[in-house]
Interface confidence: low
């Protein structure tokens, strides 16, 4: 089943997020992803937990998952590299790098996104953009076209309250508000973009979506700069 989602958002402007990727399993959308280099897509490690022997591919240049678009292209995956410390039962280190079978053909609708290397928290209240093909309502309706929503960053102290995530949010994670607008099932692995820079990746835990007391959790990419660089090298 798809992991993660966009609730309370709207359809994105077509191809305005050329870094956006759909990680697909046997031809169906599974998770979001973000193109970080010509031949590499960053996503969430938990996305491949259910993949087993299925065929994993990456769709780039897409707005609609089903309609023909000149910029769309499906790439095979040469290598999948989950973070070595990721584990099935925790949200920590939930990152995955997918090496495409060849360098992506870049153009206006396909382009890598710079990612944050400076390891400092995004200021609380900063509006960040999250996009994906995840479910758009609690009935589980899946969109065909890319959705997005702007979410304010939530400070870690609030996110770690007993009533919220009760201390689970380490310095390597960040939170965004989730009051009716939220990332959800099918959005996991997708980008949280603040000021035009990739700051976070949607985690793929089975969190309730759209509940303000259960903020969205995102893996801070800056905290994993050394690992990302080592894999991409």
């Amino acid at each position: 089943p798809p992991r993660g989602r966009i609730l309370g958002g709207r359809e994105a402007e077509a191809h305005a997020r050329p870094y956006m990727a759909s990680v697909q399993l046997n031809g169906a959308h599974l998770c979001g992803g973000v193109l970080v280099a010509e031949q590499w897509v960053l996503s969430a490690a938990h996305c491949l937990e259910d993949a087993a022997d299925g065929k994993v591919q990456v769709l780039l240049g897409a707005h609609s998952l089903s309609q023909p678009e000149p910029s769309k292209r499906l790439y095979d995956v040469l290598r999948a590299v989950p973070h070595p410390d990721s584990q099935p039962d925790t949200i920590d280190h939930d990152l995955l790098l997918l090496q495409l079978s060849e360098k992506a053909t870049l153009g206006p609708a396909v382009r890598p996104l710079p990612w944050q290397r400076v390891d400092r928290d995004v200021a609380p209240g900063t509006l960040c953009d999250v996009a994906g093909w995840g479910i758009v309502n609690h009935a589980g309706r899946r969109p065909d076209s890319l959705q997005h929503v702007l979410l304010p960053v939530l400070d870690r102290a609030t996110c770690n309250r007993r009533t919220h995530h009760d201390g689970a949010i380490t310095e390597r994670l960040m939170c965004a508000e989730s009051n009716r607008r939220d990332s959800c099932k099918g959005d996991s692995g997708g980008p949280l973009v603040c000021g035009g820079v990739l700051e976070g990746v949607v985690t793929s835990g089975s969190r309730v979506c759209g509940n303000r007391k259960k903020p969205g959790i995102y893996t801070r990419v800056a905290s994993y700069a050394a690992w990302i660089d080592s894999v991409l090298a």
Epitope: P114, R117, V118, R120, A123, G195, G196, V197
Partner: antibody, heavy 117, light 107 residues
Framework: QVQLQQSGAELAKPGASVKMSCKAS????????MHWVKQRPGQGLEWIGY????????EYNQKFKDKATLTADKSSSTAYMQLSSLTSEDSAVFYC??????????WGQGTSVTVSS | DIQMNQSPSSLSASLGDTITITCHAS??????LSWYQQKPGNIPKLLIY???NLHTGVPSRFSGSGSGTGFTLTISSLQPEDIATYYC?????????FGGGTKLEIK
């Protein structure tokens, strides 16, 4: 090594505009934000704003919102700042500084702007 | 905007002395504080980032401490080349703001 080379001193009349440049080398220009800082003679430092050269996204100090315009040319790895409607208050040295690791860790040599009739 | 109040505004000390400059933020900035040194006629140079981390190439006689709203820069065993103006800067939220500076002179 990282270098930021700024354009030369400017002498301008009140009401005029100037555009200064900051050419980056020694790192991937599009991966890091470029900040601009003002220093009036004998005074302290003021943050003007930054640009993300990758997509041209800008963030300004409200104080400079109508004064400064930040742009960047990826092909030449050059950031620009245009100052408009100049007054004597704009006479200052303007620095570009890139935020690569932890703070504004690499600075240009500064561009001096003198506004005089 | 977050105000950064730096003190003292000027300071005179003898070679070999240990001196302390303080910076107070008008609201909590966690550890997002940097210290810069600007020698006369020169450009600012990063000394300390994230309140207490020494930037590459900076002598170990410089140290920083603090978190929240109160921060200090300490220079031990003052050297002639330390004559400069020192600025703190918060990186917690935009707009970034600097302290007013501390001008250090040798007695």
């Amino acid at each position: 090594q990282v270098q930021l080379q700024q354009s030369g001193a400017e002498l301008a009349k009140p009401g005029a505009s100037v555009k200064m440049s900051c050419k980056a080398s020694g790192y991937t220009f599009t991966n890091y934000w470029m900040h601009w800082v003002k220093q009036r003679p004998g005074q302290g430092l003021e943050w003007i704003g930054y640009i993300n050269p990758s997509i041209g996204y800008t963030e300004y100090n409200q104080k400079f919102k109508d004064k400064a315009t930040l742009t960047a040319d990826k092909s030449s790895s050059t950031a620009y700042m245009q100052l408009s409607s100049l007054t004597s208050e704009d006479s200052a040295v303007f620095y570009c500084a890139t935020f690569i690791y932890y703070a504004m860790d690499y600075w240009g040599q500064g561009t001096s702007v003198t506004v005089s009739s | 905007d977050i105000q950064m109040n730096q003190s003292p505004s000027s300071l005179s000390a003898s070679l070999g002395d240990t001196i302390t400059i303080t910076c107070h933020a008008s609201q909590n900035i966690n550890v997002w504080l940097s210290w810069y040194q600007q020698k006369p006629g020169n450009i600012p140079k990063l000394l300390i980032y994230k309140a207490s981390n020494l930037h590459t190439g900076v002598p170990s006689r410089f140290s920083g401490s603090g978190s929240g709203t109160g921060f200090t820069l300490t220079i031990s065993s003052l050297q002639p080349e330390d004559i400069a103006t020192y600025y703190c800067q918060q990186g917690q939220s935009y707009p970034y703001t600097f302290g007013g500076g501390t001008k250090l002179e040798i007695k």
